[in-house]
Interface confidence: medium
């Protein structure tokens, strides 16, 4: 799943609020022990930024070797640098681990731009700022890579949190989270709060700053406001969901809702942008351009190739529209919407010499592999990956960037008919979204 770009037919019939309150599961329903409440030891355990990925500290081997690992819900391999590389400060040294076991099998993962390859094995793994457990997990020891590691990103490996179906070399390689749940009493659920800074961070600031939280095995109430709304996981491969309607500043894009999910829609922490299928991207950009027409921006900006800058503190957030994605709800004919601000989809960029300016990249881009709800979306919300109940929850993040006039929102219920028809039935292929 990629960091710059991815470091990868019918109408929803309405979807507009009709004032009809449909029944839904309350946010306060009793659940398994340990699923809710406070997870103090895990709060603030992520660092990084949307453009280069968010990472968590992990240890591998005996004695433990500490590595920073990119949290990626768009892939399913646990893979770590295991050989010297110009962009790595450290790497996994298998020969120093008394608990390493070689699986005598290689793995090769090509992407649209770049690749990694390595050797499969297992070792003991733990997460210092996570649950107090150690598991034996599959590890791909990366011995060769091209355009995979990012200079200055400060992570040395990737934790693929999606399902076995997209694991490489095949679905027999058990992903880390499956191993964790099988070998411990950790509930089959994790949640992510990715915190965009709202301004560019230099290298030392990233190292010193908090990037968010990965709560393993539960939900922490302090990380969100309002209610959690859940959308079904359509199929357990990527974290696939169904979008039933899209609005720009409240204006329906009025597309056949199948287009929004062509050929799938996924939630992917390893992708920077909100990526949209070609037709949807073109319609969305047209609408965003029209809404922000008080200023004329270069075409290269809308293509993500050029930046726009304003004098520090004068970014006219108000001229840019909010974007709402309506997601299928858990109840028949019920949907809810998540709304992001320009503070999420205009990404601050740090490589500009004129430091008295605030410069941004348009972080919505075109995709040929469906909708990817990357960091741009996730930075607005606390996202619960409830694998046990095959659903993903969204609530407004306590750390999202906003202004005094508008805030990100999660709202519902809305009546939306025939939502099942919004899903696209994809031909079976083996693919990964990493770095496409």
């Amino acid at each position: 799943t990629q960091h710059g770009i991815r470091l990868p037919l019918r109408s929803g019939l309405g979807g507009a609020p009709l004032g009809l309150r449909l029944p839904r599961e309350t946010d306060e329903e009793p659940e398994e022990p340990g699923r809710r409440g406070s997870f103090v030891e895990m709060v603030d355990n992520l660092r990084g930024k949307s453009g280069q990925g968010y990472y968590v500290e992990m240890t591998v081997g005996s004695p433990p070797q500490t590595l920073n690992i990119l949290v990626d819900t768009g892939s399913s391999n646990f893979a770590v640098g295991a050989a010297p590389h110009p962009f790595l400060h450290r790497y996994y040294q298998r020969q120093l681990s008394s608990t390493y076991r070689d699986l005598r099998k290689g793995v090769y993962v090509p992407y649209t731009q770049g690749k990694w390859e390595g050797e499969l094995g297992t070792d003991l793994v733990s997460i210092p700022h996570g649950p107090n457990v150690t598991v034996r997990a599959n590890i791909a020891a990366i011995t060769e890579s091209d355009k995979f590691f990012i200079n200055g990103s400060n992570w040395e490996g990737i934790l693929g949190l999606a399902y076995a179906e997209i694991a490489r070399p095949d679905d027999s390689l058990e992903p880390f989270f499956d191993s964790l749940v099988k070998q411990t009493h950790v509930p089959n659920l994790f949640s992510l709060q990715l915190c965009g800074a709202g301004f560019p961070l230099n290298q030392s600031e990233v190292l010193a700053s908090v990037g968010g939280s990965m709560i393993i095995g539960g939900i922490d109430h302090s990380l969100y406001t309002g209610s959690l709304w859940y959308t079904p996981i359509r199929r357990e491969w990527y974290y696939e969901v169904i979008i039933v309607r899209v609005e720009i500043n409240g204006q329906d894009l009025k597309m056949d809702c199948k287009e929004y999910n062509y050929d799938k829609s996924i939630v992917d922490s390893g992708t920077t942008n909100l990526r949209l299928p070609k037709k949807v991207f073109e319609a969305a950009v047209k609408s965003i351009k029209a809404a922000s027409s008080t200023e004329k921006f270069p075409d290269g900006f809308w293509l993500g190739e050029q930046l726009v800058c304003w004098q520090a503190g004068t970014t006219p957030w108000n001229i840019f529209p909010v974007i709402s994605l309506y997601l299928m709800g858990e109840v028949t004919n019920q949907s809810f919407r998540i709304t992001i601000l320009p503070q999420q989809y205009l990404r601050p960029v740090e490589d500009v010499a004129t430091s008295q300016d605030d410069c941004y990249k348009f972080a919505i881009s075109q995709s040929s592999t469906g909708t990817v709800m990357g960091a741009v979306i996730m930075e607005g919300f606390y996202v619960v990956f409830d694998r046990a109940r095959k659903r993903i929850g969204f609530a407004v993040s306590a750390c999202h960037v906003h202004d005094e006039f508008r805030t990100a929102a999660v709202e519902g219920p809305f009546v939306t008919l025939d939502m099942e028809d919004c899903g696209y039935n994809i031909p079976q292929t083996d693919e990964s979204t990493l770095m496409t």
Partner: nanobody, 127 residues
């Protein structure tokens, strides 16, 4: 790290020609503006020529119109300033610069448009 390196300066007789080059490297995003500026001894830096990328519009200062031509080679990440019919008043240090879109900058030669500048190359025109 962004670097701009000018070359091609030198001394020439009035009426002569020079071609300045500027190699741009390390720029993460396509620049919106690319420009040539000059600074004569004891004077303010002034814009000579500028191009808006994507739109392709080229702007020239009145004093050089018809004599100077701005061109670029995207494949080589290089911009050029062809200077013909040079005059003694063209004597100056010439700088290339690149920058991003800025809503507040008023003209193509507003130096606030430009993020990165070369070190400059001396052009001397004698009569």
């Amino acid at each position: 790290d962004v670097q701009l390196q000018e070359s091609g300066g030198g001394s020439v007789q009035a009426g002569g020609s020079l071609r300045l080059s500027c190699a741009v490297s390390g720029f993460s995003y396509s620049p919106y503006y690319m420009g040539w500026f000059r600074q004569a001894p004891g004077k303010e830096r002034e814009g000579v020529a500028a191009i808006r990328k994507g739109i392709g519009t080229t702007y020239y200062a009145d004093s050089v119109k018809g004599r100077f031509t701005f061109s670029q080679d995207d494949a080589k990440n290089t911009m050029y300033l062809q200077m013909n019919s040079l005059k003694p008043e063209d004597t100056a240090i010439y700088f290339c610069a690149v920058g991003h879109y800025r809503a507040y900058a008023t003209t193509s030669f507003d130096p606030r448009r430009y993020d990165y500048w070369g070190q400059g190359t001396q052009v001397t025109v004698s009569s």
